[in-house]
Every structure is written in structure tokens, then in C-alpha cells.
């Protein structure tokens, strides 16, 4: 996930936000799956 060649603060911010959103989605799916399996 290189997300381009720009290293300015805005590009870094957008990349960080994307990672947070992605992890939140993944963890949310895992949590829902655990609840569903109980």
C-alpha cells in the first residue's frame, strides 16, 4: 500500500485516516463475526 509518491502533510494525513478507517472496518467485521458465532 504505497499510496503514491507525495510526502506532504496532507497526503500523510489522508493515508493515516485511510489506515484507521480500514482497521476499524476489519475489526468491526471480526467483532460482528464473533458475536454472530456465539
Amino acid at each position: 500500500h504505497s499510496d503514491g509518491i507525495f510526502t506532504d502533510s496532507y497526503s500523510r494525513y489522508r493515508k493515516q485516516m485511510a489506515v484507521k478507517k480500514y482497521l476499524a472496518a476489519v475489526l468491526g467485521k471480526r467483532y460482528k463475526q464473533r458475536v454472530k458465532n456465539k
Epitope: 500500500h1 504505497s2 499510496d3 503514491g4 509518491i5 507525495f6 506532504d8 502533510s9 496532507y10 497526503s11 494525513y13 489522508r14 493515508k15 485516516m17 485511510a18 489506515v19 478507517k21 480500514y22
Partner: antibody, heavy 109, light 111 residues
Framework: VEESGGRLVTPGTPLTLTCTAS????????MGWVRQAPGKGLEWIGD?????TTDYASWVYGRFTISRTSTTVTLKMTSLTTEDTATYFC????????WGQGTLVTVSS | AAVLTQTPSPVSAAVGGTVTIKCQSS????????LAWYQQKPGQPPKLLIY???TLASGVPSRFSGSGSGTEFTLTISGVQCDDAATYYC???????????FGGGTEVVVK
């Protein structure tokens, strides 16, 4: 960068536009969509990260959806009105550093 | 959503002269410098000139420069050439990307 899928549609018809790339790996870049109505200015629609997470302009109101595979980025549009008539551009990076020629979407009854 | 207001069109310039285009945002851009400038000629897609308020994009001539911070930004073209006749747009990036927006554009006419 190349966009495709633009055509004449009637109001309310859904339409999907596709963006492909040559000379670089699309999967390594965030990609954005921008539109331009005939004779008007540029309008930012939204973008998609390499992780597949998306952000949209506040005016989109869930009518448009951006998604991606390893080789394409798509813009799915629903509830189209005549106001959505425009050339739709796909561009690379959050800073929109490389643009395609655009694909024309005409919404008319 | 943010509103970006640009210098009204058209702006006239003589070859060899200097052109200044202003872009004012209704709210501060991210980190006070998340602003880009684009050049668009008729029938062509836009081209990135400046990003992060003042950083020149790859391959862009040094006669283009950007400045400003927060809500007020400027694109300057020094030593204007005929090839610079185009419409110029600013794009603001914000803490909430839902606010991202372009300015209305400024047409530059070269005499």
C-alpha cells in the same frame, strides 16, 4: 489514466464509469473522481485509498459509490438527474497529479 | 462544504508580465497548506501545477509559484508566456475531506 462508460442516459438510470491505468500500477495509488459540467468549473466528487476506504464530497449524499479492484477504479452513480450531465475525470493521488481525458455523461429525457 | 473564491475572470496579462491569481477559502485548509493549483486548457484535462500551497509539481516551469497559508492563497506566473493562456483552479483539502472543493476558476488571457 483512461475513463470509460460515459453515455446518454435518461434521468433515474444508474450508470457505472470505469477508470484504468497504463504505465503505472493502479493498486499503488489513491484515485479520485472529479466532474465538469459543460462550460463550467471543476467539482470534486471523492476518492478511494489503496485500502479501499472512500471519502466523498458532502453534496454526493450517497448517490455515488467509488470502488476498486487491482486494475480498475469504478464510480457507480444512481438517481441521476440532468444536473449530473458532465465530463467525469479520474485522477491519480490525493493531489490529482495525473488525469485522464474524461468520459462524457449526458442525462436527458 | 468549503467555498473557495477565486479572482474573477478574465485576468489579462502581457507576454513577459506577471499574473497573480488569488484563492480565498471559507475555512482553513488542513495544516494551513493543503491547497493545490491546476491549469486547464480548452478540450484538455486539468494539469497539477502546485500542491501543498507552494510545492511545484514535477515538470512544471519555475515561472509558476504558489504562496499563502490558512485561508488566503496566491498563484503567481512570472514572465508570462502565450502558452499560459488557460483557466486556473485552486483545490482545498480539509480535515474532513467531505469539505474538499475547487474554486470557480480564473481565466487568464495573454495579450
Amino acid at each position: 489514466v483512461e475513463e470509460s462508460g460515459g453515455r446518454l442516459v435518461t434521468p433515474g438510470t444508474p450508470l457505472t464509469l470505469t477508470c484504468t491505468a497504463s504505465g503505472f500500477s493502479l493498486s499503488s495509488y489513491a484515485m479520485g473522481w472529479v466532474r465538469q459540467a459543460p462550460g463550467k468549473g471543476l467539482e470534486w466528487i471523492g476518492d478511494i485509498s489503496t485500502y479501499g476506504t472512500t471519502d466523498y464530497a458532502s453534496w454526493v449524499y450517497g448517490r455515488f459509490t467509488i470502488s476498486r479492484t487491482s486494475t480498475t477504479v469504478t464510480l457507480k452513480m444512481t438517481s441521476l438527474t440532468t444536473e449530473d450531465t458532465a465530463t467525469y475525470f479520474c485522477a491519480r493521488d490525493y493531489w490529482l497529479s495525473l488525469w485522464g481525458q474524461g468520459t462524457l455523461v449526458t442525462v436527458s429525457s | 462544504a468549503a467555498v473557495l473564491t477565486q479572482t474573477p475572470s478574465p485576468v489579462s496579462a502581457a507576454v513577459g508580465g506577471t499574473v497573480t491569481i488569488k484563492c480565498q477559502s471559507s475555512q482553513s485548509v488542513y495544516d494551513n497548506n493543503a491547497l493545490a493549483w491546476y491549469q486547464q486548457k480548452p478540450g484538455q484535462p486539468p494539469k497539477l501545477l502546485i500542491y501543498a500551497a507552494s510545492t511545484l509539481a514535477s515538470g512544471v516551469p519555475s515561472r509558476f509559484s504558489g504562496s499563502g497559508s490558512g485561508t488566503e492563497f496566491t498563484l503567481t506566473i512570472s514572465g508570462v508566456q502565450c502558452d499560459d493562456a488557460a483557466t486556473y483552479y485552486c483545490l482545498g483539502g480539509y480535515y474532513d475531506p467531505a469539505d474538499n472543493a475547487f474554486g470557480g476558476g480564473t481565466e487568464v488571457v495573454v495579450k
